[in-house]
Amino acid sequence: DLQEADLDLLRVTLSSKPQALATPNKEEHGKRKKKGKGLGKKRDPCLRKYKDFCIHGECKYVKELRAPSCICHPGYHGERCHGLSL
């Protein structure tokens, strides 16, 4: 597990209004895909495996955590940018 300070740093880097990092249960989405061969650029998991994770926001894949995080559209809130704010 990443240290708490590293998590905070990642959040601040991803968004000016940091959201909690949301890491889906990998059991719910099958086994991890194997890493691609060669030195070519890896495809962004947010475009496939986690394409539906952020409901009203943008998915940012945090390589250090092997996990997606969400940056919410204005007015939305929550780990998955799922809800209209109060």
Partner: antibody, heavy 116, light 106 residues
Framework: QVQLVQSGAEVVKPGSSVKVSCKAS????????MHWVKQAPGQGLEWIGE????????TYNQKFKAKATLTVDRSTSTAYMELKSLTSEDTAVYYC?????????WGQGTTVTVSS | QIVLTQSPTTMAASPGEKITITCSAS?????MYWYQQRPGFSPKLLIY???NLASGVPVRFSGSGSGTSYSLTIGTMEAEDVATYYC?????????FGGGTKLEIK
Amino acid sequence: QVQLVQSGAEVVKPGSSVKVSCKASGYSFSGYYMHWVKQAPGQGLEWIGEINPSTGGITYNQKFKAKATLTVDRSTSTAYMELKSLTSEDTAVYYCTRITWAFAYWGQGTTVTVSS
Amino acid sequence: QIVLTQSPTTMAASPGEKITITCSASSSVTYMYWYQQRPGFSPKLLIYDTSNLASGVPVRFSGSGSGTSYSLTIGTMEAEDVATYYCQQWSSYPPTFGGGTKLEIK
């Protein structure tokens, strides 16, 4: 594996306060909001609020804003909910819960009984 | 806040029977979530994002719907399915739950 372990049952007097704890393990505590849900006897589920352990940011259900106070202690990976000015209406089971794609992990529940 | 109305409130079914529980929302929601709560236990996630099966949930459970109308279906009722079922939305804060459907066995 992810575990949320809550404090034991409480019997308290009307007008007093109670603090329920939820100790998390098996994941990075700061990485997920902690939510709290109320279930009164024989009743359904009510969302109380959520706290972001990383920032301390809290969103309450307006209904519980004057009743509940959510806090966390990151050093012990523990979330707390304090309930104040207790009445018989607050007699319920209180759950902490955490998402994956929804509320997938739940504590075992803490029964709070308000009785004189 | 969005009010979720479940029907029926209580129902009894025979083993092998197909069960459908409906959840009607007072305003349109993006997705619906379903939970099972057996007596004396914490709720358990069954369905997320309207139709996706949570980890470890038997394939006899399925979810569908859109807008303000959603449903949970149990393909073939089994004795272990005796529980109360709740729908939940979080498209608008605060997240809300339906009043529950108590499923009993005949």
